[in-house]
Structures are given as C-alpha cells and as structure tokens.
C-alpha cells in the first residue's frame, strides 16, 4: 500500500487531538528519558509505513499493540483518510479477531510505543531535516 495519497493534515489533526494522548496514557509511569530512541522516517508516507509496521505487527519482545486504544484510533484515521487503505486490512482484521490475547504491557512494548511517539512527531514535522 502506498500512503502518498493520504490526507496528511487530517491525520495530523487526529494525532494531535486524540492519538497522542492515548500514546501518553500508555506510557504513563515511564520517564521521557527512559528509552533512547533512534527511530527515523524520511517523509510523511514513509513515516506512516513505519507507524503501520510498529503499531499493528509483533516485533522482538512485544507481541501485540494492535488492541490498544491508540492503535484502534490510528487504524480508523488511516481508513478514513487514506484511500484504499481499508482493503489492505481485511485479512488483518480477521486474523486479529481469531487471536485475542490477554493484554500484557512489557518493557519492550513501552520501548516500541516510545518509538511510535518519535515517528508521529517526525510525521508532524515533515519539513525538518532528518538528524
């Protein structure tokens, strides 16, 4: 899927009004300096690809974030403001329904959400030069 045709300003507004708050809620109790993030993305479509990757897929040490509030709102925002995105998610939604697991917040998941916060911040500042 190509995120080039998304309405980036609407997605940014959704992030600022609600998704960012849900990410902060998830991270509550952790210090902002606790995770040393080196995440990167080069432009808005690339940032959304990385956000898609880390929000809806298991990674080393963190089995699932897809059922978290910020993830569901991210999926809704992409479905509404990225033409054709919903069609890519049919298999994924069915697979998620099959395996609803007990929520366990591990340190690795906190680290991953911290990475997501960095990617979202980068998405919101597309004209800044990448460090």
């Amino acid at each position: 899927y190509d995120f080039t045709n998304c309405d980036f300003e609407k997605i940014k507004a959704a992030y600022l009004s609600t998704i960012s708050k849900d990410l902060i809620t998830y991270m509550s109790g952790t210090k902002s300096t606790e995770f040393n993030n080196t995440v990167s993305c080069s432009n808005r479509p690339h940032c959304l690809t990385e956000i898609q990757s880390l929000t809806f897929n298991p990674t080393a040490g963190c089995a699932s974030l897809a059922k978290e509030m910020f993830a569901m709102k991210t999926k809704a925002a992409l479905a509404i403001w990225c033409p054709g995105y919903s069609e890519t998610q049919i298999n994924a939604t069915q697979a998620m329904k099959k395996r609803r697991k007990r929520k366990v917040t591990t340190n690795k998941c906190l680290e991953q959400v911290s990475q997501l916060q960095g990617l979202w911040r980068r998405f919101n500042r597309p004209l800044l030069k990448q460090q």
């Epitope: 899927y1 990167s40 990385e50 990757s53 880390l54 298991p58 298999n91 994924a92 998620m96």
Partner: nanobody
Framework: QLQLVESGGGLVQPGGSLRLSCAAS????????MGWYRQAPGKQRELVVT???????NYVDSVKGRFTISRDNTMNTAYLQMNSLKPDDTAVYYC???????????SGKGTLVTVSS
C-alpha cells in the same frame, strides 16, 4: 508465496562472530518486517530481532548490543550480524518476513548456529 533462504550458519567458538543472510524471492520486499527467530534444543521458538521496512530495529535484551539486524531493500536481503557469541546462542535461526498490512508470516527452513569450544 514468499520464499526465504537463510545462509551463514555454522560452528563458532565462544566470543566469535557470524553473519547470517536471508534472501527473499519477493520483488516488493519493502512491505515486510523482517526478523530472526531462534529455537534452541528443547526450547520454544523466540523472536529475537526485527527490522521495519524503513530500518527501525527492535531486539530482545539477551542479544541487544551483540546482534545487529540490517536489510538491503534493493537486494531483497536481510542480515543478522552476531558478535560476542555465547553457548546460549546455540540454536536454529529462522528468517521471518511479515507483510505489514496483512498479518501474514513467512519463514525460511532455518540455519544452525552452534557456539562451542
């Protein structure tokens, strides 16, 4: 169906290094999170490292600082550089690719890494 072929495994002494490679058949390699699972004798398979399409990485604590995952999207290949290897790292290492949109996983047949003196 995505085909994955691992190479680079072998016998190495404690403290030594190995570099595993994973070649993928898919032309659209850039829609996959790539990762490496390992399975030691009598233990469950564990996902030890992952890399997103854009190169953002995650490691389990037991390999952090010793293992480095990288990818070359033009060559459809992922790499795992393993340094300061320990006997505990002995396992079959499986390359894994996950389509970031469809919750579909593909794995290779595995390559054996043995760390022993």
């Amino acid at each position: 169906q995505l085909q994955l072929v691992e190479s680079g495994g072998g016998l190495v002494q404690p403290g030594g290094s190995l570099r595993l490679s994973c070649a993928a058949s898919e032309s659209d390699f850039s829609i996959y999170i790539m990762g490496w699972y390992r399975q030691a004798p009598g233990k469950q398979r564990e996902l030890v490292v992952t890399i997103t399409p854009g190169g953002n990485t995650n490691y389990v604590d037991s390999v952090k600082g010793r293992f480095t995952i990288s990818r070359d999207n033009t060559m459809n290949t992922a790499y795992l550089q393993m340094n300061s290897l320990k006997p505990d790292d002995t396992a079959v290492y499986y390359c894994n690719a996950r389509n970031i949109f469809r919750n579909v996983d593909y794995s290779g047949k595995g390559t054996l890494v043995t760390v022993s003196s």
